[in-house]
Interface confidence: low
Amino acid sequence: TERLCHPCPWEWTFFQGNCYFMSNSQRNWHDSITACKEVGAQLVVIKSAEEQNFLQLQSSRSNRFTWMGLSDLNQEGTWQWVDGSPLLPSFKQYWNRGEPNNVGEEDCAEFSGNGWNDDKCNLAKFWICKKSAASCSRDEEQFLSPAPATPNPPPAGSGGGLNDIFEAQKIEWHEHHHHHH
């Protein structure tokens, strides 16, 4: 029997050594953090231009406003990732023109169109989780195999409480309209 390497759980997307889950439901920013934690992941922290380009493409293709793990909640105007790392100066070029504008306490960052926007953290939006891909043993080839018939279970200790993450998500991504100031 051919042994395949499955670097990511069912319905997660593999990119450059990491697995990404693009939600099909919406939560506020804080609940999005919890959602990712419950599946052993983190609300996405972007580490490279390639990763940003990949994620922006996923978001813009689906025309969805999507939370990332970036906020200035700790100190107004100082943007920080949920892992505690600061926003690199080069990453500031990803803000949409005129953003971040902090109109009405907009302290959390989202993918919006072809760039980033700051918005109110209590708004429900889609979100992206990120975790390291499983490494394959040497006699296995690391590549994206056909998806397994059933979802991989959540990691041990993850709580497994987020049924919406592991539900079969066959519905078409719908257009999500939202106005920014």
């Epitope: 231009a49 105007g77 100066p89 070029q93 803000w95 023109r97 504008n101 072809n114």
Partner: antibody
Framework: QVTLRESGPALVKPTQTLTLTCTFS??????????VSWIRQPPGKALEWLAL???????YYSTSLKTRLTISKDTSKNQVVLTMTNMDPVDTATYYC??????????????WGRGTLVTVSS | DIQMTQSPSTLSASVGDRVTITCRAS??????LAWYQQKPGKAPKLLIY???SLESGVPSRFSGSGSGTEFTLTISSLQPDDFATYYC????????FGQGTKVEIK
Amino acid sequence: QVTLRESGPALVKPTQTLTLTCTFSGFSLSTSGVSVSWIRQPPGKALEWLALIDWDDDKYYSTSLKTRLTISKDTSKNQVVLTMTNMDPVDTATYYCARTPSGSYGRYFDLWGRGTLVTVSS
Amino acid sequence: DIQMTQSPSTLSASVGDRVTITCRASQSISNWLAWYQQKPGKAPKLLIYKASSLESGVPSRFSGSGSGTEFTLTISSLQPDDFATYYCQQYNSYWTFGQGTKVEIK
């Protein structure tokens, strides 16, 4: 028309503090995405980035020189000031200020001042 | 810090030649790379940004390519005004310049 002009002393003694001013026109440092940098070039050598200040007052410094550098801005005067402490003869260079434009194509330097030559000597 | 290495350091060429300068980054910088031209006693002038986008007013004989860690600046047909020193610069993480490539008359 967009212009940048550097000004400051042509001669500095070792251990002294250098203060350089970049006065610009044709753009505003309060416009989102715009920043001003200082870059230097020793005679016959390559360009070296020193410091950058953003429209939102974020400041960034060269790792190797950050303990000696301070960058600040006066938006109302359209000026950016760089101070460099404990000057040494190896700091002899032409000092340039340059603009980073607003937009989504990255944080390169699209416009430069003419530069000012600073000599460090006793 | 990201290091940028240009090659060659000096390039001897004649008018009409096709000239290629290479720039390598010590780690991936996606396409966050700019090229500048500098003439003696003058400030650098932006030629290319985002690895391959031509700055407004720059002649079309200049072109840039590459992504990740390897980049090239090409001058399709060298003109008398092109003899200068060329620098690459990354802006993926802070800002770093290459050591420069001097294009001189053969």
